[in-house]
């Protein structure tokens, strides 16, 4: 058993049918010695008396808010949560496996640049009685500071019969140098509590591996005289690291017909302009990627050919 | 990534082309190592990230873009004198560069070159003959060092009398390649920045 926060405790259980469970001793936080009784949740049934209460925690029915009283007055509370270990592996019931970029990916994180700011998100089908708390650091043995905000519900989607909820959090490394070469990964730890179930999820990454630039901005077309060709131009996104001559991007320019089946013409360039043939009803899209370290491509920025 | 490669103009900052070749070569070598050594811990998540140049060179600090010198977090041990030799910089660009930058890059390359050559000698003794260092990568390191044209005493190749542990050597190869790829990215950024200056 360990303390998650004041008066909230996590009991770790080897989870299998007929398991013996864990013996837990609760102590009433009071100078009183006599006349103390214990109850669980809203029940008025007295579970025991005395300054300490010994319980065998086996299942969720044994978890909850234990309260010690004296003469009708509440003295203190202890909330017991359960953390299930199923055959040596901690349970992952609360969050959905996003399966991207690989199986057992519960937390996904992205950064728009090298400033040390990043966003993580996760999915669940649970709508109520759910709380999250997020901590992060650079490295784990001698951790350096990363400050995270509160996790917020960022999207709701309908997936078949189920509703899916996306939560996200923004974090910022306290003293980040955009040009630094990372040797210790960022660690992100999410505590999830659903009713009386506790779970924790972690992700470990280098900022350089989660970079996804914003799409190029100010995408414009300039027709070339007496030609079907157009000059496409664009700019670096505002959120990208500066100076751009140091943090350079490379670009992919795509001409896509109205139908998805039509052949796509693609050109790669390090410049912020390109000359392409604009077909009728086609659209021109441009996306960006770090020129020197191949992390994710940005989403496409698009303009119609006409 | 298989992108069309632009040929640099003759007037272009001469080291840029070499640094681009270096990044391409080390990235290819790392990819090859990860595929060949699939049963070894060779992915970024599995290896210890060690920097053999740590406390010996200061490339990131010495080559920091001027715009980032205002960032407190970037100023660990920054040297501020300006470059006075090295053939990569035309004289009119000299003032844009700090003294230690190119020599620090040169020292990095020299240290990695020695490590890679020592390691290759060990890998050649492996009866499995599983993996060797790409000669192209070693040649590209050499070309960039020559383009940097710094005079420094040659570091003797380390020779080891004890029987090599091939498992450990292959893991060390992965560690070295990951670190060298990161340094090659920094070198490319620096060369690109200098070219634009």
């Amino acid at each position: 058993i360990w303390e998650l926060k004041k008066d909230v405790y996590v009991v770790e259980l080897d989870w299998y049918p007929d398991a013996p469970g864990e013996m837990v001793v609760l102590t009433c936080d009071t100078p009183e010695e006599d006349g103390i009784t214990w109850t669980l949740d809203q029940s008025s049934e007295v579970l025991g008396s005395g300054k300490t209460l010994t319980i065998q925690v086996k299942e969720f029915g044994d978890a909850g808010q234990y309260t010690c009283h004296k003469g009708g007055e509440v003295l203190s509370h202890s909330l017991l949560l359960l953390h299930k270990k199923e055959d040596g592996i901690w349970s992952t019931d609360i969050l959905k496996d996003q399966k991207e970029p690989k199986n057992k990916t519960f937390l996904r994180c992205e950064a728009k640049n090298y400033s040390g700011r990043f966003t993580c998100w996760w999915l669940t089908t649970i709508s109520t009685d759910l709380t999250f708390s997020v901590k992060s650091s650079r490295g784990s043995s001698d951790p350096q500071g990363v400050t995270c905000g509160a996790a917020t519900l960022s999207a709701e989607r309908v997936r078949g019969d189920n509703k899916e909820y996306e939560y996200s959090v923004e974090c910022q490394e306290d003293s980040a140098c955009p040009a630094a070469e990372e040797s210790l990964p960022i660690e992100v730890m999410v505590d999830a509590v659903h009713k009386l179930k506790y779970e924790n999820y972690t992700s470990s990454f280098f900022i350089r591996d989660i970079i996804k630039p914003d799409p190029p901005k100010n995408l414009q077309l300039k027709p070339l005289k007496n030609s079907r060709q157009v000059e496409v131009s664009w700019e670096y996104p505002d959120t990208w690291s500066t100076p751009h001559s140091y943090f350079s991007l490379t670009f992919c320019v795509q001409v896509q017909g109205k139908s998805k089946r039509e052949k796509k013409d693609r050109v790669f360039t390090d410049k912020t302009s390109a000359t392409v043939i604009c077909r009728k009803n086609a659209s021109i899209s441009v996306r960006a990627q770090d020129r020197y370290y191949s992390s994710s491509w940005s989403e496409w920025a698009s303009v119609p050919c006409s | 990534r298989n992108l069309p490669v632009a040929t640099p103009d003759p007037g272009m900052f001469p080291c840029l082309h070499h640094s681009q070749n270096l990044l391409r070569a080390v990235s290819n070598m790392l990819q090859k190592a990860r595929q060949t050594l699939e049963f070894y811990p060779c992915t970024s998540e599995e290896i210890d990230h060690e920097d053999i140049t740590k406390d010996k060179t200061s490339t990131v600090e010495a080559c920091l873009p001027l715009e980032l010198t205002k960032n407190e977090s970037c100023l660990n041990s920054r040297e501020t004198s300006f470059i006075t030799n090295g053939s990569c910089l035309a004289s009119r660009k000299t003032s844009f560069m700090m003294a230690l930058c190119l020599s620090s890059i040169y020292e990095d390359l020299k240290m990695y070159q020695v490590e890679f050559k020592t390691m290759n000698a060990k890998l050649l003794m492996d009866p499995k003959r599983q993996i060797f260092l790409d000669q192209n990568m070693l040649a590209v390191i050499d070309e960039l060092m020559q383009a940097l044209n710094f005079n420094s005493e040659t570091v003797p190749q380390k020779s080891s009398l004890e029987e090599p542990d091939f498992y450990k050597t292959k893991i060390k190869l992965c560690i070295l390649l990951h670190a060298f790829r990161i340094r090659a990215v920094t070198i490319d950024r620096v060369m690109s920045y200098l070219n634009a200056s």
Partner: antibody
Framework: QVQLVQSGGGVVQPGRSLRLSCAAS????????MHWVRQAPGKGLEWVAF????????YYADSVKGRFTISRDNSKNTLYLQMKSLRAEDTAVYYC????????WGQGTMVTVSS | SYVLTQPPSVSGTPGQRVTISCSGG????????VKWYQQLPGTAPKLLIY???QRPSGVPDRFSGSKSGTSASLAITGVQAEDEADYYC????????????FGTGTKVTVLG
């Protein structure tokens, strides 16, 4: 004590269907994940499928994906394996089993796919 | 498509020490715990070892398990006639959990 009693096995022609049941008692069935494991005659153990305690997630071996469906009825304390488009290579003893460090197995039920 | 490899058979005379190996990889045994089962003819498998080296109550102490890196082993110290059976190791793969990964199985024969 924990008990898993299996039923539903038998002889079936290729391409036909069969449903296996596993009745649980002696524990809170709705709190635990459950597996199906099979063993072809003279061969080793092969995992078939898993279902979470609440039925929310199901996992299958590639060899049965799209043909077999694992399900549970927590109100009846019963686990099921619906087998469709049966093939000769599905001939095996099928076991249900609890998930956890200490597990409990059903007695096994023989499924023979033969024309 | 077994990923955990065991020797097909091992044998010993009563009283001898018999060991069975189970060889896997970084993503399975290297990252997860190992179980060992005993299966007597015509019966369901019986758990002998869980969490690499833990014995459930009721399992004789002549059975012991260990794990090192990407392989595990089961030892029967002082093998007895009633130990003649098939033995299977089991683990998980970190990418496909909760799918059970079973070993190829080992037939233990007690001679004499």
């Amino acid at each position: 004590q924990v008990q898993l009693v299996q039923s539903g096995g038998g002889v079936v022609q290729p391409g036909r269907s069969l449903r296996l049941s596993c009745a649980a008692s002696g524990f809170t069935f709705s709190s635990y994940g459950m597996h199906w494991v099979r063993q072809a005659p003279g061969k080793g153990l092969e995992w078939v499928a898993f279902i979470r305690y609440d039925g929310s997630n199901k996992y299958y071996a590639d060899s049965v994906k799209g043909r077999f469906t694992i399900s549970r009825d927590n109100s009846k304390n019963t686990l099921y394996l619906q087998m469709k488009s049966l093939r000769a290579e599905d001939t095996a003893v099928y076991y249900c089993k609890t998930h956890g460090s200490h597990d409990n197995w059903g007695q096994g039920t023989m499924v023979t796919v033969s024309s | 498509s077994y990923v955990l490899t065991q020797p097909p058979s091992v044998s010993g005379t009563p009283g001898q020490r018999v060991t069975i190996s189970c060889s896997g990889g970084r993503s399975n045994i290297g990252s997860n715990t190992v179980k060992w089962y005993q299966q007597l003819p015509g019966t369901a498998p019986k758990l002998l070892i869980y969490h690499n080296d833990q014995r459930p109550s009721g399992v004789p102490d002549r059975f012991s398990g260990s794990k090192s890196g990407t392989s595990a082993s089961l030892a029967i110290t002082g093998v007895q006639a009633e130990d003649e059976a098939d033995y299977y190791c089991q683990s998980y793969d970190r990418g496909t959990h909760p799918a059970l990964l079973f070993g190829t199985g080992t037939k233990v024969t007690v001679l004499g």
